[in-house]
């Protein structure tokens, strides 16, 4: 299996009840506006074939896509949560900037690409869905990167 390096987040990043709650509240607000409940972005298919030692790297890719292609373009929506959560997630992304995989990561890129394609295919409703799953993104980062 490919070796991942620097793919760690300090536990303290997830020991801030206020921002954790705000992340969940942002996800909830967006989830209420999401009518497509059959599609799950951060679910079984995303993790398929990716071992736990590679999982943090996988979630880093999802985090970066979510920030750049979803949260930044939608930054005027779902206030006041968005203005607090986005900088927090951006800091996590920055702390994972040195997280790389030595070796073949094609299987990971394939899974991430499917998520990206789904979001793009759904258009704005795909972006809303991605925001509605920020609680899942947050928890997946916590599970994989600590």
């Amino acid at each position: 299996a490919p070796i991942s390096s620097h793919c760690r987040l300090d536990k303290s990043n997830f020991q801030q009840p206020y921002i954790t709650n705000r992340t969940f509240m942002l996800a909830k607000e967006a989830s209420l506006a999401d009518n497509n409940t059959d599609v799950r972005l951060i679910g079984e298919k995303l993790f398929h074939g990716v071992s736990m030692s590679e999982r943090c790297y996988l979630m880093k890719q999802v985090l970066n896509f979510t920030l750049e292609e979803v949260l930044f373009p939608q930054s005027d929506r779902f206030q006041p949560y968005m203005q607090e959560v986005v900088p927090f997630l951006a800091r996590l992304s920055n702390r994972l900037s040195t997280c790389h995989i030595e070796g073949d990561d094609l299987h990971i890129q394939r899974n991430v690409q499917k998520l990206k394609d789904t979001v793009k295919k759904l258009g704005e409703s795909g972006e809303i869905k991605a925001i509605g799953e920020l609680d899942l993104l947050f928890m997946s980062l916590r599970n994989a990167c600590i």
Epitope: K11, F24, A27, T37, E44, N143, I146
Partner: antibody, heavy 121, light 110 residues
């Protein structure tokens, strides 16, 4: 086939200690978060504690925090629950449970048969 | 006291549909992305029947379906059968990193 087998239950006096074990087989143990869930006689399910794949995060229900400690040994495919300062209300059947898929430790898709803990004077 | 509120019992005749609700405070349950449902027959181990709000594990009958709306998640059992008589529990992960269970609902097939 996924198998989870709990052991270590028994009768203990209030204030006493017990260590529960869960032996896992049939899957790659260190790809999954693991949980302990309990059920008092005739009552509903109560989540007790959970640990992520590498032991980096350990979470507890408010009712056991500070008294119980969850741990895992991935080399031995084993999950543990150290229970100290036991109270009568800790009397229950204790289940070891695994997530349905490795990205979802909160969806408990595989359960052991449980080990009974009785706290009584 | 369970954080998630379920009706203590529901009943229906064979062939009918029954729905069990699971309601929680918004701060506790977030967006309900983490909702699961379990079936437990007397003296048996709990069985996962719905995960990720509305997904069914392999081997679970398609008569079981899950949904969410606002602060309420629901489990619907359609075309009720005698073997569906059981206790049902909802659960959800929370922003405090704990998993909460509902108090359970006894389904009776009349």
């Amino acid at each position: 086939e996924v198998q989870l087998v709990e052991s270590g239950g028994g009768v203990v006096r209030p204030g006493g200690s017990l260590r529960l074990s869960c032996a896992a087989s049939g899957f790659t143990f260190d790809d999954y978060g693991m949980n302990w869930v309990r059920q008092a006689p005739g009552k509903g399910l109560e989540w007790v504690s959970g640990v992520n794949w590498n032991g980096g995060t350990r979470d507890y229900a408010a009712s056991v925090k500070g008294r119980f400690t969850i741990s895992r040994d991935n080399a031995k495919n084993s999950l543990y629950l150290q229970m100290n300062s036991l109270r009568a209300e800790d009397t229950a059947l204790y289940y070891c449970a695994r997530g349905w898929y490795s990205g979802s430790p909160w969806s408990l898709g595989h359960w052991g048969r449980g080990t009974l803990v009785t706290v009584s004077s | 006291q369970a954080v998630l509120t379920q009706p203590s019992s529901v009943s229906g005749s064979p062939g009918q549909s029954v729905t069990i609700s699971c309601t929680g405070a918004s701060g506790d349950v977030g967006a309900y992305n983490f909702v699961s449902w379990y079936q437990q027959h007397p003296g048996k181990t709990p069985k996962l029947i719905i995960y990720d709000v509305n997904k069914r594990p392999s081997g679970v009958s398609n008569r079981f379906s899950g949904s969410k709306s606002g602060n309420t998640a629901s489990l619907t059992i359609s075309r009720l059968q005698a073997e569906d008589e059981s206790d049902y529990y909802c659960s959800s992960y929370t922003s405090r990193y704990t998993t909460e269970f509902g108090g359970g609902t006894k389904v009776t097939v009349l």
